[in-house]
Structures are given as structure tokens and as C-alpha cells.
């Protein structure tokens, strides 16, 4: 996930936000799956 060639603060911010969103979605799916399997 290189996400482009820009290293300015806005590009870094958008990349960080994307990672957070992605992790939240993945963890959310895992949590739902765990609840479903109980």
C-alpha cells in the first residue's frame, strides 16, 4: 500500500485516515463474526 508519491502533511493525513477506516472495518467485521458464532 504505497499510496502515491506525495509526502506532504495532507497526503499523510489522508493515508492515516484511510488506514484507520480500514482497520475499523476489518475489526468490526471480526467482532460481528465472533458474536454471530457464539
Amino acid at each position: 500500500h504505497s499510496d502515491g508519491i506525495f509526502t506532504d502533511s495532507y497526503s499523510r493525513y489522508r493515508k492515516q485516515m484511510a488506514v484507520k477506516k480500514y482497520l475499523a472495518a476489518v475489526l468490526g467485521k471480526r467482532y460481528k463474526q465472533r458474536v454471530k458464532n457464539k
Epitope: H1, S2, D3, G4, I5, S11, A18, K21
Partner: antibody
């Protein structure tokens, strides 16, 4: 380079999917954005998609448009189209929109 | 959504002269510098000139200069050439990307 396709004449309410493909660059390593421009008007930011597949949209989109991606393409799915959506649609690379395609024209008319 | 207000069109300049285009945002951009400038010629897609308020994009001539911070930004073209006749747009990036928006554009006419 990047190139858009899928633009055509549709009637109001018809869904339409636009596709952005690349030659000579690996799209999967870049965030990609969509921008539109109505005939004779200015540019309008639609939204973008990160390399992780997470998306952000302009507030005016109101859930009518969806951006998604595969390893080789980026798509813009549009629903509930109205005549106001008539425009040339561009895809562009990076959050700063550093490399643009030539655009694809979408005409919404009854 | 943010509103970006640009210098009204058209702006006229003589070859070799200087053009100044202003872009004012209704709210501060991210980190006070998340603003880009684009050049668009008729029938062509836009081209990135400046990003992060003042950083020149790859391959862009040094006669283009971006400045400003927060809500007020300026694009200056020094030693204007005929090839600079185009419409110029600013784009603001914000804490909430849902606010991201372009300015209305400023047409530059070169005499």
C-alpha cells in the same frame, strides 16, 4: 496514463457505471479520485478511494455515487441520475489529482 | 461543504507581465496548507501546478508560484507566456474530506 470509459446518453433515473483504467502505471499503488465538469462550467470534486479501498465523498453526493476498485480498475457507480449530472467525468491519480484522464461524457436527458 | 471563491474572470495580462489569482476559502484548509492549483485549457483535462499551497508539481515551470495559508491563497505567474492562457482552479482539502471543493475558476487571457 489513465483513461475513463462508460460515458453515454442515459435517461433520468438510469444507473451508470464509469471505469478508470491505466496503462504504464500500477493503479493499485495510488489513491484515485473522481471529478466532474458540466459543459462550460467549473470542476466539481466527487470523491476518492484509498489503496485500502476506503472511500470519501463530497457532502453533496448524498449516497448516490459509489467508488470502488480492483487491482486494475477504479469504478464510479452512479444512481438516481438527473439532468444536473450531465458532465464530463474525470478520474485522477493521488489525493492531489496529479495525473488526469481525458474524461468521459455522461449525458442525462429524457 | 467549503466554498472557495476565486478572482473573477477574466484576468488579462501582457506577455512578460505578472498575473495574480486569489483563492479564498470559507474555512481553513487542513494544516493551513492543503490547497492545490490546476491549469485547464479548452478540450483538455486539468493539470496539477501547485500542491500543499506552495510546492511546485513535477515538470511545472518555476514562473508559477503558490503562496498563502489558512483561508487565503494566491497563484502568481511571473513572465507570463502565451501558453499560460487557460482557466485556473484552486482545490481545498479539509479535515473532513466531505468538505473538499474546487474554486469556481479564473480565466487568464494573454495579450
Amino acid at each position: 496514463s489513465v483513461e475513463e470509459s462508460g460515458g453515454r446518453l442515459v435517461t433520468p433515473g438510469t444507473p451508470l457505471t464509469l471505469t478508470c483504467t491505466a496503462s504504464g502505471i500500477d493503479l493499485s499503488g495510488y489513491a484515485m479520485g473522481w471529478v466532474r465538469q458540466a459543459p462550460g462550467k467549473g470542476l466539481e470534486w466527487i470523491g476518492d478511494i484509498s489503496t485500502y479501498g476506503t472511500t470519501d465523498y463530497a457532502s453533496w453526493v448524498n449516497g448516490r455515487f459509489t467508488i470502488s476498485r480492483t487491482s486494475t480498475t477504479v469504478t464510479l457507480k452512479m444512481t438516481s441520475l438527473t439532468t444536473e449530472d450531465t458532465a464530463t467525468y474525470f478520474c485522477a491519480r493521488d489525493y492531489w489529482l496529479s495525473l488526469w484522464g481525458p474524461g468521459t461524457l455522461v449525458t442525462v436527458s429524457s | 461543504a467549503a466554498v472557495l471563491t476565486q478572482t473573477p474572470s477574466p484576468v488579462s495580462a501582457a506577455v512578460g507581465g505578472t498575473v495574480t489569482i486569489k483563492c479564498q476559502s470559507s474555512q481553513s484548509v487542513y494544516d493551513n496548507n492543503a490547497l492545490a492549483w490546476y491549469q485547464q485549457k479548452p478540450g483538455q483535462p486539468p493539470k496539477l501546478l501547485i500542491y500543499a499551497a506552495s510546492t511546485l508539481a513535477s515538470g511545472v515551470p518555476s514562473r508559477f508560484k503558490g503562496s498563502g495559508s489558512g483561508t487565503q491563497f494566491t497563484l502568481t505567474i511571473n513572465g507570463v507566456q502565451c501558453d499560460d492562457a487557460a482557466t485556473y482552479y484552486c482545490l481545498g482539502g479539509y479535515d473532513d474530506p466531505a468538505d473538499n471543493a474546487f474554486g469556481g475558476g479564473t480565466e487568464v487571457v494573454v495579450k
